[in-house]
Interface confidence: medium
């Protein structure tokens, strides 16, 4: 007779990342008896929800249920039926919903309410939908990457998780770039965190961490682009905007109503005597970079040192993992290699932005034009943000590691969020034996 495999004693968790531009569903899995160990939780599935971010459903909330269906059905397939009722589901909304809430708490609540009702219809253990703070987003991203890198384990590891990993217990800083906000989180070296809003204290696995974090709302790549356009059209005072951040020959008509729809452009708002304007690309990295720098106010700083807009930033310390859009954009531009210096990145961006739009479309025929057209801006913005915004230098650039996944799990805030909400990161070091190597798939 054939041996029947013993049922796996595993647990699952689901986190939906409701970002400004889209929603993604992540399914995590871990051995039930090892849930307090570090490094045991791993991602088994990512499902990208078709369509925009949930904040865009404000005028059509009745469509939210259908919008979430495909990915929730996928979760139903991936997770064994016997586990459905024990599987927690969390939805965290980020900066897109923070912006909507700034405009109208009532509208934001209405969207979340419909999201909650839709998710409650599934056979999982729904734990709620909420807008997480920028501080949480930064903190959970930091927890995720350090958990996956094994930085919280006090035991000496006998294998290396990632090629750029250092074998010490120094944590990595986290750099997260979304569509509407960007977060910087790290442990400063013996530095007082001068601004209480930016200070976090954690005790994880028996060790204390004093962490600096800040989330810059409106400085995600999409909102930064809206800001730049709103700033530039003020000066252009014309129905045509020659824009160095788009490829030569690129043309696009923008509605002024769309430009001023977001709270991020309010500071640049003016009465324009036209309803639309046309962007005409001129593809010049240097000019694009200069234009982006005008979004960062570096003249005001009430602390010993600042990032921009008067926000305290301690001296950078150690290695950093740059993920989410930092990774996606740099991956597209083929600039994620550890060997590519900052000078080389700049040179390659100059060449890329100068390429004619028709040539770019031919070279990247499979990429949606909406995304393709914005890589010149996004790449230039990433350089501007890291160098002038966060004060990385040509030398410290080599401490930035563009990370998509670590051991098969996406770098981002969702894993850290779930670990926290399921109490899977103990304050004290658990008394358990090391995992066998085979546990890491």
């Amino acid at each position: 007779t054939q041996n029947k495999a013993l049922p796996e004693n595993v647990k699952y968790g689901i986190v939906l990342d409701a970002g400004s531009s889209h929603t993604s569903l992540y399914i995590y899995k871990w051995p039930a008896e090892k849930e307090n160990d570090t490094g045991v939780v791993h991602q088994v599935e990512e499902c990208r929800v078709k369509g925009p971010g949930i904040s865009k459903f404000v005028q059509k909330v009745n469509e939210i249920g259908i919008y979430l269906t495909d990915c929730m059905e996928r979760a139903r397939e991936v997770i064994p039926r016997s586990q459905h009722q024990e599987t927690p589901v969390y939805l965290g909304a980020t900066a897109g919903m923070r912006l909507l809430r700034m405009e109208s708490e009532e509208l934001a609540d209405r969207v979340l309410d419909v999201v909650e009702r839709s998710l409650s219809n599934y056979p999982f253990d729904f734990q709620g939908a909420r807008i997480i703070t920028g501080q949480e987003e930064g903190a959970y991203g930091w927890i995720t990457i350090n958990y996956l890198l094994g930085k919280f384990s006090q035991k000496t590891r006998w294998f290396s998780i990632v090629p750029y990993e250092t074998n010490n217990q120094e944590t990595f800083g986290a750099l997260d770039l979304g569509g509407a906000s960007t977060q910087v989180t790290f442990v400063p070296q013996n530095q007082t965190i001068e601004s209480p809003d930016n200070a976090l204290q954690f005790r994880l696995y028996g060790k204390d961490y004093n962490v600096y974090t800040h989330s810059f709302l409106c400085y995600g790549k999409d909102q930064a682009l809206w800001q730049k356009l709103a700033k530039d059209i003020q000066v252009a005072s014309n129905e045509i905007l020659r824009d160095p951040c788009f490829h030569p020959g690129y043309k696009k008509v923008v509605n002024v109503s769309d430009l001023y729809k977001t709270p991020c452009t309010k500071r640049f708002e003016m009465t324009l005597p036209f309803q639309q304007f046309e962007i005409q690309g001129i593809g010049n990295y240097q000019q694009c970079h200069q234009s982006i720098l005008e979004l960062f106010n570096t003249s005001y700083c009430p602390y010993s040192q600042c990032a921009f807009n008067g926000i305290f930033l301690p001296p950078l310390q150690g290695d950093f993992g740059a993920f989410s859009a930092f990774y996606f954009v740099m991956k597209f531009l083929n600039l994620t290699s550890e060997k590519v210096s900052q000078e080389k990145v700049t040179e390659m961006m100059k060449k890329f932005c100068a390429q004619p739009w028709e040539e770019i479309k031919t070279s990247y025929a499979g990429v949606k034009e909406k995304y393709l057209s914005e890589y010149c801006f996004s790449g230039t913005y990433i350089l501007s943000l890291l160098l002038q915004g966060y004060h990385f230098t040509a030398d410290s650039w080599e401490h930035i590691h563009f990370i998509g996944k670590i051991q098969g799990s996406d770098a981002g805030w969702t894993l850290g969020y779930m670990l926290n909400l399921t109490n899977m990161i103990p304050a004290e070091q658990p008394l358990s034996t090391p995992l066998s190597h085979s546990t890491y798939v």
Epitope: D232, A236, N238, I240, R242, F274, I282, Q290, S291, E294
Partner: antibody
């Protein structure tokens, strides 16, 4: 080759009117905003007026507001400056210049046409 | 209105000499500044835009720079055709305003 050629200048009595023209060639006129700038004898440059590519925006210097009107005919590639209630201090060489943010802000100028307001 | 204070109003220099002209803005103009050259016959030519970008066809001896609200035009080695009037122009807001001009003469 980009060319801007002003015409219509001359001698006018105070209180009189005159219309200046600027003929454009060598570029897509309908894409560009256009300016009038003047220079009084032995003085520096003074901005006078601006009109956007589609004529929806018009800006004027306080010194000419209510007296001067800027207009354009995109079909004929021509810019105009209608001047009324002229004063002696309007005596100057009048230049037209084209404008397109980011890289073509007042990048090409005409050679100028002279207006003299005198009794 | 934004005032552009240009200095010096005139300067005498010899061929091959290095000269610098400065414009100070009364309010933030964020690098929205052109440098123009006006020849004795009245012809006006833009040399620099966005504070530091050289126009195509303009000799490399011309350069523009910015330090806070001060903007400079430098000619590294004067040539005979450089003797002219120079103006700065801000285009950060309306009304557009010019500096008072600098006359560069042969010593």
């Amino acid at each position: 080759e980009v060319q801007l050629v002003e015409s219509g200048g001359g001698l006018v009595k105070p209180g009189g009117s005159l219309k200046l023209s600027c003929a454009a060639s060598g570029f897509t006129f309908s894409d560009y905003g256009m300016h009038w700038v003047r220079q009084a004898p032995e003085k520096g440059l003074e901005w006078v007026a601006y009109i956007s590519s589609g004529s929806s925006i018009r800006y004027y210097a306080d010194t000419v507001k209510g007296r001067f009107t800027i207009s354009r005919d995109n079909a004929k590639n021509t810019l105009f400056l209608q001047m009324t209630s002229l004063r002696s201090e309007d005596t100057a060489i009048y230049y037209c210049a084209r404008d397109l943010y980011y890289d073509h802000v007042l990048d090409y100028w005409g050679q100028g046409t002279t207006l003299t307001v005198s009794s | 209105d934004i005032q552009m204070t240009q200095s010096p109003s005139s300067l005498s220099a010899s061929l091959g000499e290095r000269v610098s002209l400065t414009c100070r803005a009364s309010q933030e103009v964020s690098g929205y500044l052109n440098w123009l050259q006006q020849k004795p016959d009245g012809t006006i030519k833009r040399l620099i835009y966005a504070a530091s970008t050289l126009d195509s066809g303009v000799p490399k001896r011309f350069s523009g720079s910015r330090s806070g609200s001060d903007y400079s035009l430098t000619i590294s080695s004067l040539e005979s055709e450089d003797f002219a009037d120079y103006y700065c122009l801000q285009y950060a807001s309306y009304p557009r305003t010019f500096g008072g001009g600098t006359k560069v003469e042969i010593k």
